[in-house]
Interface confidence: low
């Protein structure tokens, strides 16, 4: 190999060992019959050398640095050449470095031809191995602007006081042009300006200078986004840190076309603007930091550009001004991530601050819109607390558990609407009365409606799930001892059509000791399946539940248990079941931890089934499933 560098070219070539590898044989640069591991070639030198091995690219790298001095004479502006030509260099991993020094008053602009650049974060690498590392200067301090790959949106980077550009090319890469040019500009009065051009839909992730380390103190950095007028841009902050400011405040400023309040100032912790039409600028402004404990300012953000969606011009009013203790969250439903570009799906408050999820609270009227290609990607979860603090005031008071129509009119599917029902301990209990009798969801008779009510204890220490209930059954009411949550969960978009079937009234009633009482009025045509609460985990220790089963005068009820034995093993206490005729008070008592469960029995009158648990040994839980079937009395039961 021969490398000859012209005089006054201000080029230095350095060949040195790369990152050490565990290769068996060492390799050397051979020059004048001497074996060396590093070779430096300066302007005006001509050197001939060889390598002592067949694949020097596994051992050595080459750095070509050109110093461009714009302080003492005119600057060589225009397209930057790769010198020496790559064809004259050994096939090693190559880094071309251009170090441009200029006056503070001179702006320097790097212009990148297509393909434009894409910024990468720490630890990331470029698919083709070609990287552009760009840094600037503040006095004597080097500031990293960023590392970039090809195929992105960054078209120009403007700096002042100097710029250092390093282009890294893998040994096998055929590239023989720098891909950029340098132009002079007037002073930009800030650290740098990065221009990012979108031709169509897409996204760009960008970072503050020095990221992930701290942004220089009291500096200003601007990103200019060029966006076709027919598209919309949204900004979201992926990661940021704030330093400890002594004077001034760290902030981002937007210059948004058409805004009457330019520049719009946001804190970094604010929701950032979305749904912006056309070009806009974003600037990051640092502060004077505390000398003792400066902390760091850093920012990584994403700009997402997409077509405006049909919904983006519609405003929906969610009036929660008359609600109390309620919150509504619109959020993405969990889905498998796709690697290809997926347009963002945002919900916007007042059409401007857009984010992937939004929580609205009671007491206000909210105006929202959507910036989303497919609203089925979002769903809604609502929580409302109804509490009674004074038992004298609440007793016999009723509340309707119904999804407000404002919420049903939103173009997003409702997932859960949860009511937390709180009562004063040992003073009051609750009764749930459905508009339409309920069916308990069981494996034997699953619910197939578009929604269900999930009823569970809301006492933190108590793990008690009463079950899932849907309209169209025989359960007339559910009484519960203490705090519960009732969640209306939807399973199909058809809930909108079936919404009229929802309707549950809760009343505060005098306190009773049983955990729950189910009032069941079976229909003559169907078999009613009932199961103990906490089906999968077993009825909690020392818990008692009852079913009040009505039998019409002209009917007979057949009570059937689906196991021969309960399976419960008691550690302390006894588990028992009482079946009591309500008219005669005659009762049968079964020891669930000892006796076999009763064979199918016939009841001519309304009756009670009460199940009380002991403290079971782990793994031997109490789970019972039983059914009630009505038949006309005229049938000969023998």
């Amino acid at each position: 190999f021969e490398i000859a560098l012209p005089r006054e070219s201000n080029i230095t070539v350095l060949i040195k060992l790369g990152t050490p590898t565990l290769l068996a044989k060492p390799c050397y640069i051979v020059i004048s019959k001497r074996h060396i591991t590093m070779l430096s070639i300066k302007s005006g030198e001509r050197i001939v050398f060889t390598f002592s091995c067949q694949s020097p690219e596994n051992h050595f790298v080459i750095e070509i640095q050109k110093n461009i001095d714009c302080m003492s004479g005119p600057c060589p502006f225009g397209e930057v050449q790769l010198q020496p030509s790559t064809s004259l260099l050994p096939t090693l991993n190559r880094t071309f470095i251009w170090d441009v020094k200029a006056h503070k008053s001179i702006g320097l602009e790097l212009q990148f031809s297509i393909p434009r650049l894409r910024q990468i974060g720490p630890g990331e690498s470029c698919p083709d191995g070609v990287t552009h590392s760009i840094s600037g200067r503040i006095d004597a301090t080097v500031v990293r602007i960023g590392t970039f790959c090809s195929n992105g949106t960054v078209s120009r980077i403007k700096m002042q006081e100097g710029v250092k550009m390093a282009l890294h090319l893998p040994w096998f890469h055929p590239r023989n042009v720098s891909g950029f040019s340098i132009a002079n500009r007037s002073s930009i009065k800030r650290l740098c300006i990065i221009e990012s051009v979108f031709e169509g839909e897409g996204s760009a992730t960008l970072m503050s200078a020095n990221y992930p380390e701290g942004f220089p103190e009291d500096e200003l950095m601007t990103w200019q986004f060029v966006v076709p007028a027919h598209l919309r841009a949204s900004v979201s902050f992926l990661n940021f840190n704030l330093s400890n400011c002594e004077r001034k405040e760290e902030r981002v400023e937007y210059y948004i076309p058409g805004s009457t309040t330019n520049p719009e100032v946001f804190k970094l912790e604010d929701k950032q603007p979305g749904n912006m039409a056309g070009n806009f600028n974003l600037s990051l402004q640092g502060c004077d930091q505390d000398a003792q404990s400066p902390g760091i300012l850093r920012l990584q953000f994403q700009v997402l550009v997409q077509h405006p969606q049909n919904e983006s011009n519609k405003i929906y009013v969610v009036d929660l001004s008359n609600e109390r203790a309620m919150s509504l969250t619109i959020e993405p439903r969990p889905v498998k991530q796709s690697r290809k570009f997926v347009p963002g799906c945002f919900v916007c408050l007042e059409s401007r601050t857009c984010s992937s999820n939004l929580t609205l609270t009671s007491g206000s009227k909210h105006k929202i819109s959507f910036l989303c290609d497919d609203l089925t990607r979002l769903w809604m979860n609502v929580e409302k607390t109804i509490s009674c603090t004074d038992h004298r005031y609440c007793q016999r008071k009723s509340y309707s558990l119904q999804v407000p129509s404002d919420i049903l009119h939103l173009p997003v599917e409702l997932h859960d609407f949860s009511w937390k029902l709180l009562v004063p301990k040992d003073r009051l209990s609750l009764v749930l009365v459905p508009a339409q009798k309920l069916q308990q969801h069981t494996h034997e008779k699953p619910c197939n409606t578009s929604f269900s009510y999930l009823v569970a204890s809301a006492i933190p220490s108590q793990d008690l799930y009463f079950g899932s209930f849907c309209p169209g059954g025989s359960i007339k009411q559910i009484q519960v001892k203490q705090n519960i949550s009732v969640t209306l969960r939807t399973f199909a978009p058809s809930f909108q059509q079936e919404a009229s079937r929802q309707g549950l009234t809760v009343s505060f009633i005098p306190y009773f000791k049983e955990e729950g009482v189910f009032t069941v009025t079976p229909d003559t045509k169907s078999k009613v399946y009932l199961r103990t609460p906490n089906w999968d985990r077993g009825l909690p220790s020392l818990t008692s539940v009852s079913w009040n089963i009505s039998v019409p005068r002209d009917q007979v009820a057949c009570l059937t248990f689906f196991k021969e034995r309960s399976g419960v093993v008691c550690q302390t206490g006894r588990a028992f079941m009482i079946i009591q005729e309500q008219r005669t008070r005659a009762e049968e008592i079964f020891s669930l931890d000892e006796d076999v469960l009763p064979k199918p029995s016939f009841h001519h009158h309304s009756f009670w089934v009460n199940i009380s648990n002991c403290s079971p040994t782990s793994g031997k839980q109490l789970d019972l499933l039983f059914s009630v079937t009505l038949t006309p009395r005229t049938v000969d039961l023998t």
């Epitope: 630890g123 969990p334 498998k336 991530q337």
Partner: antibody, heavy 121, light 112 residues
């Protein structure tokens, strides 16, 4: 190539804290998708998963032992650590660390040879 | 916890014959991304476990094609089409879809 090696105290007494180190090479725990798990196996018995740490410092623990376990990592020195507090004789076992390389196999593709730990008074 | 039940407990097979090991999970082990993280490991005496099959049916690099995995939902099978002497040891199924990650009790493969 990928290797993992466990080290520990060998013997310790009940109620003491067991500290284990997994030193690895051939991969970096700063790579997206990488993770390291700890398992144990009492002599002649089956395997039990204890804890897992991901490249982004997210952690998973076996709920039955969670209150006693702490997993951590030092990415720069290629090490993962596991602490088990308040040990008793039932913690006597061979302890293994393993790599999960989700980019490649999404499974525990490489295991250390194990380190034997005896808890005895 | 997801209980992994392996059958049989031990298996005695002549060289060249087929061996089949079953693993049943107490609940479905499909993860939220659609993958079933069900693996098979072989632990030879005095050694650490070695990965054979990942994600139900994918062979790990360097594993001979006589090993195959199949199944879905809660029922999974490992088949060794022609048993060789080096295949003896304890085979474990393992799920990492749900925390805690759990192993089957193991199946000991012996050569007749």
């Amino acid at each position: 190539q990928v290797t993992l090696k466990e080290s520990g105290p060998g013997i310790l007494q009940p109620s003491q804290t067991l500290s284990l180190t997994c030193s690895f090479s051939g991969f970096s725990l700063s790579t997206s998708g990488m993770g390291v798990s700890w398992f144990r196996q009492p002599s002649g018995k089956g395997l039990e998963w204890l804890a897992h740490i991901y490249w982004d410092d997210d952690k998973r623990y076996n709920p039955s032992l969670k209150s006693r376990l702490t997993i951590s990592k030092d990415t720069s020195s290629n090490q993962v650590f596991l602490r088990i507090t308040n040990v008793d004789t039932s913690d006597t076992a061979t302890y293994y660390c393993t790599r999960e390389g989700s980019a490649d196999w999404e499974a525990l593709d490489y295991w250390g040879q194990g380190t034997s730990v005896t808890v005895s008074s | 916890d997801v209980l992994m039940t392996q059958t049989p407990l031990s298996l005695s097979v002549s060289l060249g014959d087929q061996a089949s090991i079953s693993c049943r999970s107490s609940q479905t082990i499909v993860y939220s991304n659609g993958n079933s993280y069900l693996e098979w490991y072989l632990q030879k005496p005095g050694q650490s476990p070695k990965l054979l099959i990942y994600k139900v049916s994918n062979r790990f690099s360097g594993i001979p094609d006589r090993f195959s995995g199949s199944g879905s939902g809660t029922d999974f099978t490992l088949k060794i089409s022609r048993v060789e002497a080096e295949d003896l040891g304890i085979y474990y199924c393992f799920q990492s879809s749900h925390v805690p990650w759990t192993f089957g009790g193991g199946t000991k493969l012996e050569i007749k």
